[in-house]
Amino acid sequence: GSERTCCPVNWVEHERSCYWFSRSGKAWADADNYCRLEDAHLVVVTSWEEQKFVQHHIGPVNTWMGLHDQNGPWKWVDGTDYETGFKNWRPEQPDDWYGHGLGGGEDCAHFTDDGRWNDDVCQRPYRWVCETELDKASQEPPLL
């Protein structure tokens, strides 16, 4: 099958997931497409521990994650439940700000320079993080 048992070259393994950190920017949709072409998805942050791991690798740079509300409610790209899941928004965020003058509000979430999240215009060319989970079958310990 296509299940992964180890991370691809230039990806970083952490807690049974593989992460790839871009060094150039793309709009959110193009970043999403890029991750999909890697058989992965934009990073889905499910814990404070994962937040700190990603934050450590991206540094103080605006970076897209796999969270958006382009169709109404906030949704993670892998289907993880937003309402009950981990969140790390900056104070007063998300605010769907219309004052940027670029048309529309702000529908895509990114890590800010301090790691906390902000919603922003999806067309901004930010860096991004791809994530793919390692094969669950390979997590099971061998039989003795």
Partner: antibody, heavy 118, light 107 residues
Framework: EVHLLESGGGLVQPGGSLRLSCAAS????????MSWVRQAPGKGLEWVSI????????YYADSVKGRFTISRDNSKNTLFLQMNSLRAEDTAVYYC???????????WGQGTMVTVSS | DIQMTQSPSSVSASVGDRVTITCRAS??????LAWYQQKPGKAPKLLIY???SLQSGVPSRFSGSGFGTDFTLTISSLQPEDFATYYC?????????FGPGTKVDIK
């Protein structure tokens, strides 16, 4: 040595079908997205389609969407392009190419000619 | 779709000349740009990726620069084997698109 070899081209009537193959060797095929790029006689390059390494994700140029299907068999290190409802404007040399992380194409096959004519 | 334009469409030059080809994108593509060389009857060959990174095995006389919408391919000292057609390709978003090409021929 890294190598790509296309086959399956030929003469076909408008409305007909053709299936192109691209045999890969010299690299871990399943780890790389693969693409088809075409070049009409005397013209420039036109990107056609791309497929992720695991075969889960595809993208197509609007000019072929709904008519062409890209697929792969990782157990045989082979990429395919199924071309249906062919038109005269599909006449071109078709290249398969290996994608890099910068979304460039670093390895190309020699190409296979597809001629659509009655 | 992002449109790519190249100039000039053709250039006549001599061995040893410095040749510069420009490529412009219809919208910003950051550094998501590649350059290819193609000779008649042959497949394209990758020269430059990420706007300025030299592909392994490509002579150092080839260089790329630019960011956003304007990009340049420079051949510092043209060699006999460099007479070919050169294409740029944007890799920022689907569909990937190529420039129309620049033919470099002998003066």
């Amino acid at each position: 040595e890294v190598h790509l070899l296309e086959s399956g081209g030929g003469l076909v009537q408008p409305g007909g079908s053709l299936r192109l193959s691209c045999a890969a060797s010299g690299f871990t095929f399943s780890s790389y997205a693969m693409s088809w790029v075409r070049q009409a006689p005397g013209k420039g390059l036109e990107w056609v389609s791309i497929l992720s390494g695991g075969g889960k994700t595809t993208y197509y140029a609007d000019s072929v969407k709904g008519r062409f299907t890209i697929s792969r068999d990782n157990s045989k290190n082979t990429l395919f392009l199924q071309m249906n409802s062919l038109r005269a404007e599909d006449t071109a040399v078709y290249y398969c190419a290996k994608r890099t992380p910068s979304d460039a194409f670093d390895i190309w096959g020699q190409g296979t000619m597809v001629t659509v004519s009655s | 779709d992002i449109q790519m334009t190249q100039s000039p469409s053709s250039v006549s030059a001599s061995v040893g000349d410095r040749v510069t080809i420009t490529c412009r994108a219809s919208q910003g593509i950051s550094d998501w740009l590649a350059w290819y060389q193609q000779k008649p009857g042959k497949a394209p060959k990758l020269l430059i990726y990420a706007a300025s990174s030299l592909q392994s095995g490509v002579p150092s006389r080839f260089s790329g620069s630019g960011f956003g919408t304007d990009f340049t391919l420079t051949i510092s000292s043209l060699q006999p084997e460099d007479f070919a057609t050169y294409y740029c390709q944007q890799a920022n978003s689907f569909p990937f698109t190529f420039g129309p090409g620049t033919k470099v021929d002998i003066k």
